[in-house]
Structures are given as C-alpha cells and as structure tokens.
Amino acid sequence: TERLCHPCPWEWTFFQGNCYFMSNSQRNWHDSITACKEVGAQLVVIKSAEEQNFLQLQSSRSNRFTWMGLSDLNQEGTWQWVDGSPLLPSFKQYWNRGEPNNVGEEDCAEFSGNGWNDDKCNLAKFWICKKSAASCSRDEEQFLSPAPATPNPPPAGSGGGLNDIFEAQKIEWHEHHHHHH
C-alpha cells in the first residue's frame, strides 16, 4: 500500500487535466447524457485537437462506435455541444468524408473509426464521459492498493437495459477508489 494522489476515479483515464470514462455497455444518446450526469460528468465535449486525437484513438483502438456530446437536435444543420457551445469551424475537419449527411434524421454525433459520423440518436452505442480531474492537495491523498487489471468486456451483445444500470452502479461504487495511471 502506498500513499499517492490520483486525479481520476477507478477505471477512468486521465488526459490533460481531465478524466474520461469509456463505457463498456451501450445506450442511446440521451441516456448516455444521463449516465454521465449520474457520475458527476458530462457526455464528452471536445475542446482541442489534442483531446480529439486522444479520444478518436481510444474509440478506434477498441473498434467501437461511441457517442460524444454533440448534436444538431436544437436546429437542423447547426451542431452544438451539450454544454451549449457551438461546433467551431476548425473542428469540421474531423467528420468522415461525406458526413454529416443527416440521412434519416441523423442528429447525434459519434466517433466512427477515423473520424466523426452523424447517426440516429435512438441507437444504442458506447459513450464517453468527461469531468475535471481532482486537484491533489495533501488532504486528498489516499491509501491505494494496487488496482486489479480490468478485464476486456465482451465486444458484442453487451448493451442495453440491466447492463447499463449495473455499469452505472459500478462507476458510482468505485467513485471513492482511485486508479494509478
């Protein structure tokens, strides 16, 4: 057991001052927002090219299609982050070729391989939550046992209903633990 300060909860990943949670189950876009709120986070809002590259890599490495906090639900064709900020012109380069195409009312954005895609918001996909990392003062240091390795989740058929509820509980359960990254 060692006395260490860890900025992110168990099973979250630290990057440039923020903590990210990559889900192992699937939800629709609106329920993904709820899942993030339940753990004091937000469906990911991307603020920099570095952050985009980091998140795109996380998503493509796992060969998963993953919701981000971006939609044009408020006004067709006007893409806005869940924190209310607009999609900057410089970020439009991240759409995959031919996207967003809004075929069949595709109003929510996902990480899709090399870039972004718009898809139907009702579809269940993976999601990424983001929150600020904890600042480390002496008072916040905690005793930490070495973290067990996280097993790979099953890649298909792992989404929906009870799995999501269980996972949300699991995230909350581990909130008071910290993982050394």
């Epitope: 069949g104 009702n122 269940a124 996909k125």
Partner: antibody, heavy 120, light 112 residues
Framework: QVQLVQSGAEVKKPGASVKVSCKAS????????INWVRQAPGQGLEWMGW????????NYAQKFQGRVTMTRDPSISTAYMELSRLRSDDTAVYYC?????????????WGQGTLVTVSS | DIVMTQSPLSLPGTPGEPASISCRSS???????????LDWYLQKPGQSPQFLIY???NRASGVPDRFSGSGSGTDFTLKISRVEAEDVGVYYC?????????FGQGTKLEIK
Amino acid sequence: QVQLVQSGAEVKKPGASVKVSCKASGYTFTGYYINWVRQAPGQGLEWMGWINPNSGDTNYAQKFQGRVTMTRDPSISTAYMELSRLRSDDTAVYYCARENSGYGKLFDYWGQGTLVTVSS
Amino acid sequence: DIVMTQSPLSLPGTPGEPASISCRSSQSLLHSNGYNYLDWYLQKPGQSPQFLIYLGSNRASGVPDRFSGSGSGTDFTLKISRVEAEDVGVYYCMQALQTPYTFGQGTKLEIK
C-alpha cells in the same frame, strides 16, 4: 440475457399472407434495428430488410418491395414481418436478427427461426 | 447490389489442421471511416447463424482465438488455425456497407 423469440411454424396457401413475430427481451428494444433474413431449404441467407423499432422507419430489399411490411410494437418489445402474395418459393425459415450499431452493423443476436411453408 | 462470392463452397477439414475461406465483393467494402463492413457468420447444423467476425477482422465475444479475419477492400479471408469438430457448419460472409445487405453463398466445412 438478450433473447429474440419468434412465433411458431406456419403453413400457408399460395396467394395468402403470413405474419411472423419476434419478441425481444434482455435489452432496450428501441436501441437496435431488427433485421429480417430468410433461408430457403438447403439454400443460403437472404436479407429482406430492417426496421428501426424507435421510429418505425424501414428499409426493404428491392426484391420484396410491395410484398413485405415490417412493423413493431415497442410496448411489448415485438417486431413483425408480414409477407403477402405468397408463392411456393417463399417457403423458407425466416429469422429476425438484432443489428448492433456499436460494432458497425453486426447481427449479434438471432431468433430461433420460423419455418413458413407455402403449399397448395 | 453488391455481390459476394465465397470459395470454396465445400471445405473438408482435418482436426488440428488449418482451414481458410475466401470472400470477394463486387465493390470495395472500405468505408470512409477506415473500416471494412464485412462480417462473418457460422451456421451450425440445425441452428440459427451466429457471429464470428465483425468489421473484417475483429473477433466477436466468446469466439475462440483460432478464428481470425483479414483483408480489405474487396478481398477477405476467414482462417481457422486448427480445425475442431465443433467448427462444422456453413460459414457466410456478409457485406453491411450498403443496403441491401448481401451474403456469400456459404462455405460448408465438414470434418474428414
């Protein structure tokens, strides 16, 4: 656990219609397209179309346009496939399959199949 | 429509030996996102199909690691490194790049 349970075997006369049901459980029904695939005796798999259980939007293979109707009832997590003007070559096992868009368009769960026999 | 062509249509397999199935598409299955929309399914005798490989090369949950998928564009291969008795059945490739989704004719694996 995820399950797709289909209705039982049917015997129909040429020209009649058949309606096959697919009851989903163990997941959020509206979050995944339901596809229908058929397999004639001793033959391969043939895609018929999909339905978005949330909106009811459908996409049918051209071959079945005008003869197939896919519907759903989200209140009972059930999808339906109706094929009209049946012919003898519609004799096949009809499968429903869940399309998981978290992994591209993988059909990750399949129903047990419903045998439809068209015979005079 | 995209036409999928599999070969061979019949494959005699020897337990412990490798086996390979080819699948070709009439047009590229490579999406602008970098993924190949090609899945592999196995239908065991008397059963519904079950998934094996998605997006060309990704092994799905619970699938033994003796199964592997490779290829890009129009040419794809499913390999079984060591055939086992439980692998018998018909293997299908399916393109999901565009509707109508289309399947290959199927390759029947039998144990010698």
